[in-house]
């Protein structure tokens, strides 16, 4: 039985140019995480695997950066940006936990953190 | 005793194939993920595969991906990678080596085996 | 990828002094949220594969002699062998295993 929860940042909003930190966590379980994968849509932006470590997708090197933790930093953001990310816990023995975000970038200096929300 | 013992290399001309196995022995082989990792004449080291120990997940280092197959068997303890479209630069000894996982993933290679050389030559 | 630089790259130490290895890597490899670092140490002799000497930076495999010791964070990393034995004679590379494994080029260590 899958108890466990993921806890996102949820909505939130970005200026054009700038940077957003992604971040997903699982709590209320304690199953082995072996990796966990990034993707926007159908892109895979890049995965953390438990005995490898980090790989950024090649098309997106120089605009993401791993971390914080197990987080995500886009970097120069632009408008084509704007759209759902998922974070996808990847645990034994429990299986695949999904968290989603989604992430408006702003043409304007107006760029407020949504709050945070869970996802059973 | 924890061992690890590849086979099959050799002589194979340009553009050939091989396969080569590595037996493990010694630990509960499942339970480990395993990778391959490879040693130019005179070089450093090079990581080339990596297989979970339910072989769900798999990874290549971009200088053999879409030409090597990374596999294992379980029930036969033993580790293996099928190299096609071989190259003179893929000429080294192959190690076999365990992940080390003794209390959080260290993401260290802990066990190696004694390696198998593989010269590719015309 | 993360390049792995070690310096020098050869060394040569009288017996029972001081041995220093270098290993810088290109970018950070200290992981935030357990603030390890993911970085290892192997020795390899002559005709051997590579043996594990100490990973996360400064902890010691089991069974390797404490004249062997690491330490250093984010980009800069030193091996010492505090007082060098006939034994150490070998080439040692460093491992970061932030993003998928790279390693150093190597170092090697010869007796004066």
């Known amino acids: 039985m899958m108890t466990g929860t993921i806890e996102t940042t949820g909505n939130i909003s970005a200026e054009k140019g700038g940077s957003i930190i992604l971040q997903c966590h699982l709590s209320s379980t304690t199953a082995q995480v072996t990796q966990v994968n990034w993707e926007q849509q159908d892109q895979l932006l890049a995965i953390c695997n438990a005995d490898l470590g980090w790989h950024i997708s090649p098309s997106f090197k120089d605009r993401v950066a791993p971390g914080p933790g197990l987080g995500l930093t886009l970097q120069s953001l632009t408008v084509n940006d704007t759209g759902e990310y998922f974070c996808i816990y990847h645990t034994y023995p429990d299986g695949t936990y999904t968290g989603r975000i989604f992430l408006e970038v702003l043409e304007s200096s107006v760029a407020e953190h949504g709050a945070r929300f869970q996802i059973p | 005793e924890v061992q690890l013992v590849e086979s099959g290399g050799g002589l194979v001309q340009p553009g050939g194939s091989l396969r080569l196995s590595c037996a493990a022995s010694?630990?509960?082989?499942?339970?480990?993920?395993m990778n391959w990792v490879r040693q130019a004449p005179g070089k450093g080291l090079e990581w080339v595969s990596y297989i979970s120990g339910s072989s769900s997940t798999i990874y290549y280092a971009d200088s053999v991906k879409g030409r090597f197959t990374i596999s294992r068997d379980n029930a036969k303890n033993s580790l293996y990678l099928q190299m096609n479209s071989l190259r003179a630069e893929d000429t080294a000894v192959y190690y076999c080596?365990?992940?080390?996982?003794?209390?959080?993933?260290?993401?260290?290679?802990?066990?190696w085996g004694q390696g198998t050389m593989v010269t590719v030559s015309s | 990828d993360i390049v792995m630089t070690q310096s020098p790259d050869s060394l040569a130490v009288s017996l029972g002094e001081r041995a220093t290895i270098n290993c810088k890597s290109s970018?950070?490899?200290?992981?935030?949220?357990?603030?390890?670092?993911?970085l290892a140490w192997y020795q390899q002799k002559p005709g051997q594969p590579p043996k594990l000497l100490i990973y996360?930076?400064?902890t010691r495999e089991s069974g390797v002699p404490d004249r062997f010791s690491g330490s250093g964070s984010g980009t800069d990393f030193t091996l010492t062998i505090s007082s060098l034995q006939a034994e150490d004679v070998a080439v040692y590379y460093c491992?970061?295993?932030?993003?998928?494994?790279?390693f150093g080029g190597g170092t090697k260590v010869e007796i004066k």
């Open positions: 996360w930076a400064s």
């Open positions: 491992q970061q295993s932030y993003f998928f494994p790279t």
């Open positions: 970018q950070s490899v200290l992981f935030s949220s357990n603030n390890k670092n993911y």
């Open positions: 080596a365990r992940h080390r996982i003794a209390d959080s993933p260290s993401r260290a290679f802990d066990i």
């Open positions: 010694g630990f509960t082989f499942s339970s480990y993920s």
